[in-house]
């Protein structure tokens, strides 16, 4: 199996976009419905 970094979000592999969950620490709201930071 090819190695992927899970925190990268998505990577190009054989010209195909492969997506992985991002680390919750990415602070960008990758998790649907999870409150991130404060109200900005």
């Amino acid at each position: 199996d090819a190695e992927f970094r899970h925190d990268s979000g998505y990577e190009v592999h054989h010209q195909k976009l492969v997506f992985f969950a991002e680390d919750v620490g990415s602070n960008k709201g990758a998790i649907i419905g999870l409150m991130v930071g404060g109200v900005v």
Epitope: H6, V18, A21, A30, G33, M35, V40
Partner: antibody, heavy 112, light 111 residues
Framework: QVQLVQSGAEVKEPGASVKVSCKGS????????VHWLRQLPEKGLEWIGR????????IYTPKFQDKATLTVDTSTDTAYMELSSLRSEDTAVYYC?????WGQGTLVTVSS | DIVMTQSPLSNPVTPGEPASISCRSS???????????LYWYLQKPGQSPQLLIY???HLASGVPDRFSSSGSGTDFTLKISRVEAEDVGVYYC????????FGQGTKVEIK
């Protein structure tokens, strides 16, 4: 009150397009990813895709790659989802989500 | 696609009693980083869904601690220690190891 406010219900004919909006109220929508999901009548949830408002990067579930187009207008703190070539099977409630906030849902009905 | 399968599809419960919902994924959601990419959502009648549990066993903000989740790489359980009337609705498990996919939902209603 912090919320995401979506545009109202739409009725469209097959083959038409529709653009659903999602505006941040008391919330800067351009800071976090905006996710879009749909819920078919009496059915479960499907993730359509998401957009990073900072750079416009999008990622879609493959089945929606040619169906949905996600955009954000950071000047008005509004996210948009445009659906093209509508079919009766696209009749659903569509939700936007950003951080911990969900829109109220927009019912799109496709009927001739 | 990773397929999420829930059981039961309907779960009549008694207030004050415990309840549980099962969810199975077609592929292990345990990543080598040690995190399990399994989520639980609740959609109360007439409302938008809300996040209950993230990454298998983390309670989302504001969610009562009567909710808990556990599991292995492919088999998961959401438990409510003592059901309250406000817990009725449709519960969905979901994964985001590869994109996002959801289970078909389990309707929890009061007996």
């Amino acid at each position: 009150q912090v919320q995401l406010v979506q545009s109202g219900a739409e009725v469209k004919e097959p083959g038409a397009s529709v653009k659903v909006s999602c505006k941040g109220s008391g919330f800067n929508i351009h800071v976090y990813y905006v996710h879009w999901l749909r819920q078919l009548p009496e059915k479960g949830l499907e993730w359509i895709g998401r957009i990073d408002p900072e750079n416009g990067e999008t990622i879609y579930t493959p089945k929606f790659q040619d169906k949905a187009t996600l955009t954000v207008d950071t000047s008005t703190d509004t996210a948009y989802m445009e659906l093209s070539s509508l079919r009766s099977e696209d009749t659903a409630v569509y939700y936007c989500v950003s951080s911990g906030y969900w829109g109220q849902g927009t019912l799109v009905t496709v009927s001739s | 696609d990773i397929v999420m399968t829930q059981s039961p599809l309907s779960n009549p419960v008694t207030p004050g009693e415990p309840a549980s919902i099962s969810c199975r994924s077609s592929k292990s959601l345990l990543h080598r980083n040690g995190k399990t990419y399994l989520y639980w959502y609740l959609q109360k009648p007439g409302q938008s869904p809300q996040l209950l549990i993230y990454q298998m066993d983390h309670l989302a903000s504001g969610v009562p601690d009567r909710f808990s989740s556990s599991g292995s790489g492919t088999d998961f359980t959401l438990k409510i220690s003592r059901v309250e009337a406000e817990d009725v609705g449709v519960y969905y498990c979901a994964q985001n190891l590869e994109l996002w996919t959801f289970g078909q939902g389990t309707k929890v209603e009061i007996k």
